[in-house]
């Protein structure tokens, strides 16, 4: 029986050209963790294998991190990576858990609006 | 071209003991989580082992937990699966097969090797 | 256990027809739900996994879908090559299961 739950950051949000740490965490059950795979819209992004350690795809490689611990940061972020992001964590006996992110990237922030538009 | 070629499926009898080899070639065998899946005489398919790329973790059903061991040679690239107390009930086309690096499904499986147990 | 059920043990079909394979979980998979193809002569051969993707190398004829317990195989244009068994398998909890199959052939 699957007893664990997935905690995430949840809904973020970031600057273009800033950097994220996306982070999930499994909590409530002691199965092994096999893998954790991160995904973006059906694309794989990212692998962490308890055997062989971190695997970032080919595509990603100039712009995503491994971790820190299971987590995974993405760098030169544009408003392109706006969008849901997946943690699966494969484990034994359980199985598979997802938890999902939504990352919202910003042109810029409000407070460099502001003083952009400033009227002398 | 990925490669998977079972061996060792013979006609055994009930309490006996047998293990199967498959050798894989193609890929780089010590990168992937390998698995044994069996099909029995009514065509049902049932997952009988799974072992990590390094071998570090094995995981089985409760119907061979106990019974059969999954193990793997990395410098030799094969993959066994260990059999004892084996009953009627294991006789079946025995498949060795590999998992996508994403562990969602198993890409590429072998011919199988038959193995009958009866007295 | 999760069970699978192919309703449809066996189906015929004209060369050139959509065909629709259907697959059900005893609960919510998730979308951890694959789709083999074995030949007569008992190749196996992934052509879909995680409900929708097209492993690489299968023909573009072949798709899934579904959600929660109900997913299905589609295969826009059947061709000769294609009679085969399909059998479907859930990755969401261990043990991981398969269908009974569904036997395809022509009419």
């Known amino acids: 029986m699957m007893t664990g739950t997935i905690e995430t950051t949840g809904n973020i949000s970031a600057e273009k050209g800033g950097s994220i740490i996306l982070q999930c965490h499994l909590s409530s059950t002691t199965a092994q963790v096999t893998q954790v795979n991160w995904e973006q819209q059906d694309q794989l992004l990212a692998i962490c294998n308890a055997d062989l350690g971190w695997h970032i795809s080919p595509s990603f490689k100039d712009r995503v991190a491994p971790g820190p611990g299971l987590g995974l940061t993405l760098q030169s972020l544009t408003v392109n990576d706006t969008g849901e992001y997946f943690c699966i964590y494969h484990t034994y006996p359980d199985g598979t858990y997802t938890g999902r992110i939504f990352l919202e990237v910003l042109e810029s922030s409000v407070a460099e609006h502001g003083a952009r538009f400033q009227i002398p | 071209e990925v490669q998977l070629v079972e061996s060792g499926g013979v006609l055994v009898k009930p309490g006996g003991s047998l293990k199967l080899s498959c050798a894989a070639s193609?890929?780089?065998?010590?990168?992937?989580?390998m698995s044994w899946v069996r099909q029995t005489p009514e065509k049902r398919l049932e997952w009988v082992a799974t072992?990590?790329?390094?071998?570090?973790?094995?995981y089985y059903p409760d119907s061979v937990k106990g019974r059969f061991t999954i193990s793997r040679d990395n410098a030799k690239n094969i993959l066994y699966l260990q059999m004892s107390s084996l009953r009627s009930e294991d006789t079946a086309l025995y498949y060795c097969?590999?998992?996508?690096?994403?562990?969602?499904?198993?890409?590429?499986w072998g011919q199988g090797t038959s193995v009958t147990v009866s007295s | 256990d999760i069970q699978m059920t192919q309703t449809t043990s066996s189906l015929s079909a004209s060369l050139g027809d959509r065909v629709t394979i259907t697959c059900r979980a005893s609960?919510?998979?998730?979308?951890?739900l694959n789709w083999y193809q074995q030949k007569p002569d008992g190749t196996v051969k992934l052509l879909i996994y995680y409900t929708s993707r097209l492993h690489s190398g299968v023909p573009s004829r072949f798709s899934g879908s579904g959600s929660g317990t109900d997913y299905s195989l589609t295969i826009s244009n059947l061709e000769q090559e294609d009679i085969a068994t399909y059998f479907c398998q859930q990755g969401k909890t261990y043990p991981y299961t398969f269908g009974g199959g569904t036997k395809v052939e022509i009419k």
């Open positions: 609960q919510d998979i998730s979308n951890f």
């Open positions: 097969t590999r998992w996508l690096l994403s562990l969602y499904a198993m890409d590429y």
């Open positions: 072992i990590t790329s390094g071998g570090t973790y094995t």
């Open positions: 193609g890929f780089t065998f010590s990168n992937y989580v």
